[in-house]
């Protein structure tokens, strides 16, 4: 079957899933495809309970999430509902910027220095979390 | 030990199909993400395709998107590329390897000795 | 696609010399960089990853350092046994990318 009793080597379990918290940054479609890569997802944040473990694993450094409104409305990777989920935006944020000069607005969610989040250019090379079910993940452990 | 021995290279014409197979041992191959690269006196080595563990996730160089697809049999412990509407440019020596162990990146830690396909009228 | 610029292309050594290749990355690929040997009609063979991390049974007379951009691969002392072609690879982000290599020649 495909359930496993623990999480892959290098990950944290955490209330019946998996953690992986990198230790450099990338561009938030980079951070998306390594996930993939890992049979996961950039995380997904769907309590404040889980809110506060991600920030006090990450600690205050911006770290991408799997939330984006490339194509429109806000949408969570895995298809969780983003209008009836849990948030925890900044004051006025998201504000979806074009200030910054970079092109285009502010596309992408991340975690802010205190936890808090802030849409941001997707480009940006922040690190990333990427989360998988417990019961989703393989018999084996991956290596990275 | 641990080992790759890729098979299934050979001449064929353009437009034409071959499949290449890349045999794993030594290992726990279904813990492990999974490369195919390829190497041409013109044009050094060029990667192909990576492959997560599951055979769920899968990326493509632009160069063969649409025409390769990587594929796993984990209960075979084997690895897959099958090649489709073949040119004379895909003309080289094709490897498999498997993804190692750095932590956040994608890098290769063990090679195969490569299979030769050679796409000729 | 980051870019990988590899030099020099070849280098002719005699046994005990030091040898260091270069390798220059198009943008910032962090520590994600392998080097690699590749002798001929042999499997390429991985020396060192993570930019400096020396590979499980790698001589130690084979180095690695460098950063972001910037990277540096050494042996310290040629030997015959280390005539074959290295090449830097970036693993930072697909696609991957490789150096054109270097071929190492004794004298």
């Known amino acids: 079957g495909s359930e496993r009793a623990c999480c892959p080597v290098n990950w944290v379990e955490h209330e019946r899933s998996c953690y992986w918290f990198s230790r450099s940054g990338k561009a938030w479609a980079d951070a998306d495809n390594y996930c993939r890569l890992e049979d996961a997802h950039l995380v997904v944040v769907t309590s404040w309970e889980e809110q506060k473990f991600v920030q006090h694993h990450i600690g205050p450094v911006n770290t991408w999430m799997g939330l984006h409104d490339q194509n429109g409305p806000w949408k969570w990777v895995d298809g969780t509902d983003y209008e009836t989920g849990f948030k925890n935006w900044r004051p006025e944020q998201p504000d979806d910027w074009y200030g910054h000069g970079l092109g285009g607005g502010e596309d992408c969610a991340h975690f802010t220095d205190d936890g808090r989040w802030n849409d941001d250019v997707c480009q940006r090379p922040y690190r990333w979390v990427c989360e998988t079910e417990l019961d989703k993940a393989s018999q084996e452990p991956p290596l990275l | 030990q641990v080992q790759l021995v890729e098979s299934g290279g050979g001449v064929v014409q353009p437009g034409r199909s071959l499949r290449l197979s890349c045999a794993a041992s030594?290992?726990?191959?279904?813990?492990?993400?999974m490369h195919w690269v390829r190497q041409t006196p013109g044009k050094g080595l060029e990667w192909v395709a990576i492959?997560?563990?599951?055979?769920?996730?899968?990326y493509y160089a632009d160069s063969v998107k649409g025409r390769f697809t990587i594929s796993r049999d984990n209960s075979k412990n084997t690895l897959y590329l099958q090649m489709n509407s073949l040119r004379a440019e895909d003309t080289a020596v094709y490897y498999c390897a498997r993804r190692g162990n750095s932590y956040g990146g994608y890098g290769m830690d063990v090679w195969g000795q490569g299979t030769t396909v050679t796409v000729s009228s | 696609d980051i870019q990988m610029t590899q030099s020099p292309s070849s280098r002719s050594a005699s046994v005990g010399d030091r040898v260091t290749i270069t390798c220059q990355a198009s943008q910032d690929i962090s520590n994600y960089l392998n080097w690699c040997q590749q002798k001929p009609g042999k499997a390429l063979k991985l020396l060192i990853y993570?930019?400096?991390t020396l590979e499980t049974g790698v001589p130690s007379r084979f180095s690695g350092s460098g950063s972001g951009t910037d990277f540096t691969f050494t042996i310290s002392s040629v030997q015959p046994e280390d005539i074959a072609t290295y090449y830097c690879?970036?693993?930072?982000?697909?696609?991957?990318?490789f150096g054109q290599g270097t071929r190492l020649e004794i004298k």
């Open positions: 492959i997560s563990y599951v055979g769920k996730n899968k």
């Open positions: 690879q970036q693993y930072d982000n697909v696609p991957i990318t």
């Open positions: 030594g290992f726990t191959f279904s813990s492990y993400g």
């Open positions: 993570d930019a400096s």
